[in-house]
């Protein structure tokens, strides 16, 4: 393969235009003839200067796997997807998210003690003696003298399954 | 039920090339990424790399260590992952595990570079 | 790449006793940080995730904590089985690192 200087690309033996952001080549350079550059279509991007003969397709942000579309897809950039409202991020890839998980579920007998965010799950909390919590969506757990015998019971942290991105 | 099972492994020289293979089944594998990681005799764990899931066009990633020498491949219509390991090096010797990283883990297959 | 120190690299301790391993990142990561078990022969098993979040099937007396750089694993009354190896390992950016290892041992 020749050596090609950074805005060519090997062409056989020779060296022709790479075509810009957006652009896939059409036609290579002849020797008449420049690189014949066309426009990537909605659903495909290229981001950098290419020597590439189709566009790269976008990437779909599926909310079946926890995901929701963060920057939409444009001829020059791919799509970004981030984790759907009440999901967050456990493994990072670069500048999108690798994995999604749904947060915790507090339940009966907690609190929440922190919502969750982008990058955290929920932190549940055991309500103190002497108070309670009935569904476990509470920030603060409430005073109660009469309560019934499963609300005192310490219930287990709330479990939900891996969605990946 | 996720599993993960992992083959291929065995005793080769420096130099030789070898591929290993892990079968999965219990989740829709187009939609995870898939990575491999080795772990020395010295116990030691790293990380050699991943293929991307179809949303994110099955691009790899891989560690300084195997770049260039190691390529990891999916076939998406049995659900396998591969791992292709060229120019091998006496400490390639390793048990190579494929994972659904972080939750699950193959049981392992050991690789053995020696003359 | 990202370095993670884990401390100590072996400990002794009795049965119904806590203990607490630590994992240092050379840079920040956020929470992207699991702990894994890892039983002679066998593969790392997720214990947990995102820092502090409890994977699903792990007891109670395992907990994560702590955020950008220092974080620490506790289990806290020792069982028989768990005196084997624990890993760190950061999942902010590629390579995934792990860290070097504790293998707890029976006083």
């Known amino acids: 393969l020749p050596s090609c200087k950074e805005d060519e690309y090997p062409v056989g033996s020779e060296c022709c235009p790479k075509c810009g952001p957006g652009f896939h080549v059409r036609q290579a350079c002849g020797e008449q003839t420049g690189t014949v550059c066309e426009p990537c279509s909605p659903g495909t991007y290229i981001a950098h200067f290419n020597g590439l003969s189709k566009c790269l397709q976008c990437q779909m942000c599926d909310p079946a796997m926890g995901l929701r579309t963060s920057r939409n897809c444009s001829t020059t950039a791919n799509a970004l997807c981030g984790c759907s409202p009440g999901h967050f991020c456990i493994i990072q890839d670069g500048d999108h998210c690798a994995a999604c998980r749904a947060y915790a579920t507090s339940s009966p007998g907690q609190r929440v003690q922190k919502g969750g965010t982008e990058s955290q799950d929920t932190l549940c909390q055991n309500c103190p003696p002497g108070t309670f919590s009935s569904n476990g969506t509470l920030e603060e757990c409430q005073h109660g003298t009469k309560c019934s015998k499963w609300l005192v019971t310490e219930a287990g942290p709330g479990t939900s399954s891996f969605r990946w991105v | 039920e996720v599993k993960l099972v992992e083959s291929g492994g065995g005793l080769v020289q420096p130099g030789g090339s070898l591929r290993l293979s892990c079968a999965t089944s219990?989740?829709?594998?187009?939609?995870?990424?898939m990575s491999w990681v080795r772990q020395t005799p010295g116990k030691a764990l790293e990380w050699l790399g991943f293929i991307r899931n179809q949303a994110n066009a099955y691009t790899t990633e891989y560690s300084v260590s195997v770049k260039g020498r190691f390529t990891i491949s999916r076939d998406n219509s049995q659900s396998i992952l591969y791992l292709q390991m060229n120019t091998l090096r006496v400490e390639d010797s390793a048990t190579y595990y494929c994972?659904?990283?972080?939750?699950?883990w193959g049981q392992g297959t050991t690789l053995t570079v020696s003359s | 790449d990202i370095q993670m120190t884990q401390s100590p690299a072996s400990q002794s301790a009795s049965l119904g006793e806590s203990v607490t391993i630590t994992c240092l990142a050379s840079?920040?990561?956020?929470?992207?940080l699991a702990w894994y078990q890892q039983k002679p022969g066998k593969s790392p098993q997720l214990l947990i995730y995102?820092?502090?979040s409890l994977a699903d099937g792990v007891p109670s007396r395992f907990s994560g904590s702590g955020s950008g750089t220092k974080f620490s694993f506790k289990i806290s009354s020792l069982q028989a089985e768990d005196f084997v190896s624990y890993y760190c390992?950061?999942?902010?950016?590629?390579?995934?690192?792990f860290g070097g290892g504790t293998k707890l041992e029976i006083k």
């Open positions: 995102a820092a502090t």
């Open positions: 219990g989740f829709t594998f187009t939609d995870y990424y």
């Open positions: 390992q950061q999942l902010h950016s590629t390579p995934y690192t």
């Open positions: 840079q920040t990561i956020g929470t992207w």
């Open positions: 994972a659904r990283v972080p939750d699950y």
